[in-house]
């Protein structure tokens, strides 16, 4: 498919001249950021960004790659080096420590320097590192965490927790020996380490005692409370704040977000991770966009500003399943949340960053025609005289041999939301990838986001832009008209 | 491996504070660029950049990812959308048209707008688009093309040629019908379309009549001249310029580059593409770094400045073979050339861009330990109880079944320069990938390289920075002390 207007050199020359004009107009703001938002696409490497752009464009009846994601409109881009101290290819715990605390840690640890060792409780104390969210709270800002995973998951936990094992969601997950040594589960740390104004995502079951039925799935034991200590952490959290409210469904969330008496809001919409966007019950569970909007409504009441972490956390899960359909539709919802946040905030006073914690071994090749489905087949056949998809994985559960050979695939099969793209190596879960990821930036001090940087740089840019520790002497003018 | 200094949060905090300090000091130059250099890593997607960084670092006895490539030091980064008008995943012809001419074309065409159709000679005339190199020449600058492929290959051809088929290297490759319609082979266009001061790379055989023995391989007919028209294009080219010299080996190149009487230099060091760096005969063939240095020595004599295209063209070939060892060692040599060019030029007057034309379906995953070989095995075993490599391809010739199963692999096998990494789909040649690639920029107007851009933007930034057509009214101050 060749769009006729694109056959004319003038089309490209005009477009580039406009882009140049926009580039020349870019003026680094010398002011401080009142508000900070970090949008984290978990597992959203550059190949995921491009594929999602095409899919989002095609959902709007365009050919695809010529369209813009909301994140594409951010004026500044850098590359972020994602390795952890001990691994070339990291996990979401070590990376969260990097971009949220500004220090690199070890694989599967959270909020701890690399002096801490995975699963060794006694290496926790003294090695805690403090997140930018925590520093923002200390500076009088309101703070929030929004995610499509459980709120105790590795990425959001980087904002408030310190643990040698990212899997210690509730005390039932923590070995007795570690509990005796004083190591706390992540759910406990969520409500006790710091005062978080808005907490939205999944993870109900880690907050309630074992045997507590889940309000949405009372018939499923596996979805009920998991805690062994008998604590109802939601109740404990509610007791801390006069204006606190807990919600577990979309209707309650929308009501609470508009209620001026609500000062603190916890919404836990699934027992574990939230459902994929394509499986979401739209009456019961809010979308990431809706959660982001609700969070912004509450947080933006604070004249001192806010810090907000928004995670498209299940992009990663779709990739781990080698189901690109899930990963890419999650990426689109993540981008929709970015777009909505842009409408609800001003780049005059809000530094917004979009990045990924790591990438995936996910590729998009095979020379498909422009406008063809991102989930479709490559032109021609492979060496084995069978069709193959343009999307593929290096490793993962999509690998299967049928009668000692690679299975054939049809366009209708590959377009299915359940289809697992093939891989070179069979694994239970497809792995992360170690290449650099993009950082997109907009707002005050966004111009500092440049070149190739360590992932830790992200936390430092946020701290500096908002004059938070250790950059309180940031020497940046406050936004005209900001109040303290 | 956990470096003890990295266990301390101060290590990361200090490093990030320094990076912030550097970012704050970045001052967009308001001057024009006297010189333009575009470094093109053919097939050098972000996954290739990261893997090459680790390999280059490990060759210096470091752990790897914490080190810097020369391109990593460039202060500005953008992402480039590489699709061609007709394909989601492009080739090196259509992309060369984009980044060298500023207009997107169709798959496998070069220097033509998308109104031209692949292989249809009669769609050539009237659809030619003019490269920035051509415009630089018209503005009185010296110009050069350096590549590790044949100089008539798709990427360098984008600087000077217009053809509906990138494979028309010599007239022997052009169908008789197309020749009769007036379509010229690329080698002919190399010497006749414009005056190029420096031409260095491979591609001897396309310049000489059929039956002409190759000077380096006189006993191998397949390496001799291919031309059917009986022309000796080298002779024709030499006749055009008083100070022209032709060289075919490293010794002659080094001599010529230091000879002040040489005004034009053509060095063709192999009959076809140059050898992979790991196979190069260092007495006969120059490295990409040496060719780059030679080109800069000649071109920098012009007080009006120069345009130089430098291509690491065989990164792509290594990937097409699914031989990551070749692709990554080519990337390191490419980076060495960038480093050397940086030593020989000044960022005060030279805009240097580094980018790729497209990526490859190449991934780096599997959670390997820091410091482990980039060519090594992932920890643990796959579902089939066999080892697997951290580097893998989505598709390509590395796919093989042994007794109806995926072959096992050892560390010594995977570390071999000949080893082909496994892929999900068996193809004769691994394919390009369609995700965005990085653009690294340094020098005057480098700050315009920002955000997510169409690949065409690259050509326009170069033209604008040097006040070339269509940006002659660029309104940029010339560099202090520049002469005309």
């Amino acid at each position: 498919i060749i769009p006729v207007e694109e056959e004319n050199p003038d089309f490209w020359n005009r477009q580039a001249a406009e882009a140049l004009g926009a580039a020349k107009k870019l003026q680094p703001a010398q002011t401080a950021a009142k508000n900070l938002i970090i949008f984290l696409g978990d597992g959203m490497g550059v190949s995921t960004v491009t594929a999602a752009r095409i899919l989002k464009g095609q959902k709007k009846d365009k050919l695809g790659p010529e369209t813009f994601l909301a994140m594409d409109r951010f004026p500044y881009v850098a590359l972020s080096k994602t390795y952890s101290v001990d691994k070339h290819v990291p996990d979401s715990g070590a990376t969260a420590t990097a971009y949220l605390c500004g220090v690199k840690g070890n694989f599967q640890t959270i909020g701890l320097s690399a002096a801490a060792r995975f699963n060794q409780c006694n290496t926790t104390r003294g090695n805690e590192v403090i997140s930018v969210m925590n520093r923002a709270k200390k500076a009088g800002k309101s703070v929030g965490v929004v995610t499509t995973t459980r709120v105790q998951h590795a990425s959001p936990a980087g904002a408030y927790a310190h643990t040698v094992n990212r899997n210690w969601y509730s005390d039932a997950d923590v070995p007795a020996s570690a509990r005796q040594e004083g190591c706390q589960d992540i759910a406990t740390q969520l409500i006790s380490n710091m005062d978080i104004d808005v907490i939205l995502g999944g993870g109900r079951k880690y907050m309630f005692p074992m045997g507590t039925p889940d309000p949405e799935y009372p018939d499923d034991y596996s979805q009920g409370g998991t805690r062994l200590d008998g604590k109802n952490l939601v109740q404990e959290w509610l007791a801390k704040h006069q204006g606190a409210r807990y919600v577990w469904n979309r209707t309650e969330l929308l009501q609470a977000s508009l209620d001026p008496s609500v000062t603190h809001l916890m919404g836990l919409f699934e027992p574990g991770d939230m459902k994929y966007e394509i499986h979401r019950d739209s009456t019961l569970d809010p979308s990431l966009m809706e959660m982001t909007e609700a969070a912004l409504l509450l947080l933006s009441r604070n004249p001192r500003g806010f810090f907000l972490f928004v995670e498209g956390g299940r992009i990663d899960h779709g990739h781990h399943e080698s189901r690109a359909y899930r990963a890419l539709t999650e990426t689109i919802m993540f981008d929709d949340a970015i777009e909505r946040a842009g409408q609800l905030t001003s780049e005059e006073d809000t530094l917004s960053l979009v990045t990924a914690d790591h990438s995936h071994v996910f590729s998009f090749g095979g020379y498909p025609l422009r406008g063809s489905s991102i989930f479709g087949l490559a032109p021609g056949k492979a060496r084995d005289r069978k069709a193959y998809t343009v999307l593929l994985y290096g490793n993962g559960p999509g690998y299967v041999l049928k009668d000692g050979a690679r299975p054939d695939v049809t366009e209708s099969e590959s377009g299915s939301p359940e289809y697992r793209q093939q891989s070179a190596v069979p694994l239970d879960g497809e792995t992360h990838a170690g290449e650099d990821v993009a950082v997109f930036a907009r707002g005050p001090q966004a111009h500092l986001v440049h070149g190739v940087q360590e992932q830790t740089f992200i936390a430092h840019v946020m701290a500096f832009a908002a004059c938070l520790e250790p950059y309180t002497a940031c020497d940046l003018a406050p936004r005209a008209g900001t109040t303290d | 491996i956990i470096p003890v200094e990295e266990e301390n949060p101060d290590f990361w905090n200090r490093q990030a504070a320094e990076a912030l300090g550097a970012a704050k000091k970045l001052q967009p130059a308001q001057t024009a660029a006297k010189n333009l250099i575009i470094f093109l890593g053919d097939g050098m997607g972000v996954s290739t950049v990261t893997a090459a960084r680790i390999l280059k670092g490990q060759k210096k006895d470091k752990l790897g990812p914490e080190t810097f490539l020369a391109m990593d030091r460039f202060p500005y980064v953008a992402l480039s959308k590489t699709y061609s008008v007709d394909k989601h995943v492009p080739d090196s012809g259509a992309t060369a048209t984009a980044y060298l001419c500023g207009v997107k074309g169709n798959f496998q065409t070069i220097g033509l707008s998308a109104a031209a159709r692949f292989n249809q000679c009669n769609t050539t005339r009237g659809n030619e688009v003019i490269s920035v190199m051509n415009r630089a020449k018209k503005a009185g600058k010296s110009v050069g093309v350096v590549t590790t492929t044949r100089v008539q290959h798709a990427s360098p051809a984008g600087a000077y040629a217009h053809t509906v088929n990138r494979n028309w290297y010599s007239d022997a490759d052009v169908p008789a019908s197309a020749r009769q319609e007036g379509c010229q082979d690329i080698a002919t266009q190399l010497i006749s379309n414009m005056d190029i001061d420096v031409i260095l790379g491979g591609g001897r055989k396309y310049m000489f009549p059929m039956g002409t023995p190759d000077p380096e391989y006189p006993d191998d007919y397949s390496q001799g001249g291919t031309r059917l028209d009986g022309k000796n294009l080298v002779q024709e080219w030499l006749a055009k310029h008083q100070g022209a010299r032709y060289v075919w080996n490293r010794t002659e190149l080094l001599q010529a580059s230091l000879d002040p009487s040489v005004t034009h230099l053509m060095g063709l060091f192999e009959p076809g593409d140059m050898k992979y760096e790991i196979h190069r005969d260092s007495t006969l063939d120059p490295s990409l770094m040496e060719m780059t240095e030679a080109a800069l020595l000649l071109l920098s004599r012009n007080p009006r400045g120069f345009f130089l295209f430098v291509e690491g063209g065989r990164i792509d070939h290594g990937h097409h073979e699914s031989r990551a060892y070749r692709a990554l060692t080519e990337t390191i040599m490419f980076d060495d050339a960038i480093e050397r060019a940086g030593q020989l030029t000044s960022e005060e007057d030279t805009l240097s861009l580094v980018t790729a034309d497209h990526s490859h379906v190449f991934s780096f995953g599997g959670y390997p330990l820091r410091g482990s070989s980039i060519f090594g095995l992932a920890p643990g075993k796959a579902r089939d109880r066999k080892a697997y490599t951290v580097l893998l391809y989505g598709n390509g010739p590395g796919y093989v079944l042994k007794d109806g199963a995926r072959p096992d692999v050892t560390e010594s096998e995977s570390g071999s320069p000949e080893y082909r990494q496994q892929s999900a789909v068996p193809l004769d040649g691994e394919t390009h990938a369609g995700e965005d690639v990085a653009v690294f920029a340094r020098g005057p107007q480098a700050h315009l390289v920002h955000g997510v851009q169409e690949q065409t933007f690259i050509a326009h930034v170069m033209a604008f920075a040097a006040c070339l057509e269509p940006y002659t009214a660029c309104d940029l101050a010339p560099r202090a002390g520049t002469t005309d």
């Epitope: 596996s222 019950d281 739209s282 359909y325 299967v400 359940e418 | -």
Partner: antibody, heavy 123, light 106 residues
Framework: EVQLVESGGGLVQPGRSLRLSCTAS????????MSWFRQAPGKGLEWLAL??????????EYSASVKGRFTISRDNSKSILYLQMNSLKTEDTAVYYC??????????????WGQGTLVTVSS | DTQMTQSPSSLSASVGDRVTITCQAS??????IAWYQQKPGKAPKLLIH???SLQSGVPSRFSGSGSGRDYTFTISSLQPEDIATYYC????????FGQGTKLEIK
């Protein structure tokens, strides 16, 4: 409370057509994958057809045994699932069930079933 | 398409016995297996999903395990009310039932 009620079964001659309905209530119909199954007398359960939800474009899948003869569809305004059965054969005699998928652990498990409707194909 | 081979097809056991039913998939189904109980004239009833997750109201004597291609369903102590036909269902790739196991009391 989730409820699925099948209707439209009965006696039909070979070669004729029949349309089964499944009326859903107690949930947001458009958000869920729906399927048809059957069970021939004294035999096991067999999946026939699936229709996905709004978010995935209401795409359909069929088992090889009924592809081309049976068509699954849905009327979202009425929360009704249909199975159009053409060219019926005697071996299509079975109790037909509709079922709703729930995405527990991201798998489309069949958590809710109707009570079934009997289709008898006989001359 | 994924095939499911369930065994045994019928089983006679005494009250209090430990009963085991197995299902083997023709390819890896990534733990997406459910087990259903069906009594005559009734719709199937979900007991276990995702290999081992027990539905509420289902007695804890029912359990499931497995991974890859091989899965097991166990009744730790057979009760009279457990007389029924049991089916495995893979839902990784569309849906496929096992052939069923008819459980009888000796």
């Amino acid at each position: 409370e989730v409820q699925l009620v099948e209707s439209g079964g009965g006696l039909v001659q070979p070669g004729r057509s029949l349309r089964l309905s499944c009326t859903a209530s107690g949930f947001t119909f458009t958000d869920y994958y729906m399927s048809w199954f059957r069970q021939a007398p004294g035999k096991g359960l067999e999946w026939l057809a699936l229709i996905r939800n709004k978010a995935t474009g209401y795409t359909t899948e069929y088992s090889a045994s009924v592809k081309g003869r049976f068509t699954i569809s849905r009327d979202n305004s009425k929360s009704i699932l249909y199975l159009q059965m053409n060219s019926l054969k005697t071996e299509d005699t079975a109790v037909y069930y509709c079922a709703r998928a729930s995405f527990y652990y991201d798998g489309k498990v069949l958590a809710y079933w109707g009570q079934g409707t009997l289709v008898t194909v006989s001359s | 398409d994924t095939q499911m081979t369930q065994s045994p097809s019928s089983l006679s056991a005494s009250v209090g016995d430990r009963v085991t039913i197995t299902c083997q998939a023709s390819q890896d189904i990534n733990k997406y297996i459910a087990w259903y109980q069906q009594k005559p004239g009734k719709a199937p009833k979900l007991l276990i999903h995702y290999t081992s997750s027990l539905q509420s109201g289902v007695p804890s004597r029912f359990s499931g395990s497995g991974s890859g291609r091989d899965y097991t369903f166990t009744i730790s102590s057979l009760q009279p009310e457990d007389i029924a036909t049991y089916y495995c269902l893979q839902y990784d790739n569309l849906y496929t039932f096992g052939q069923g196991t008819k459980l009888e009391i000796k």
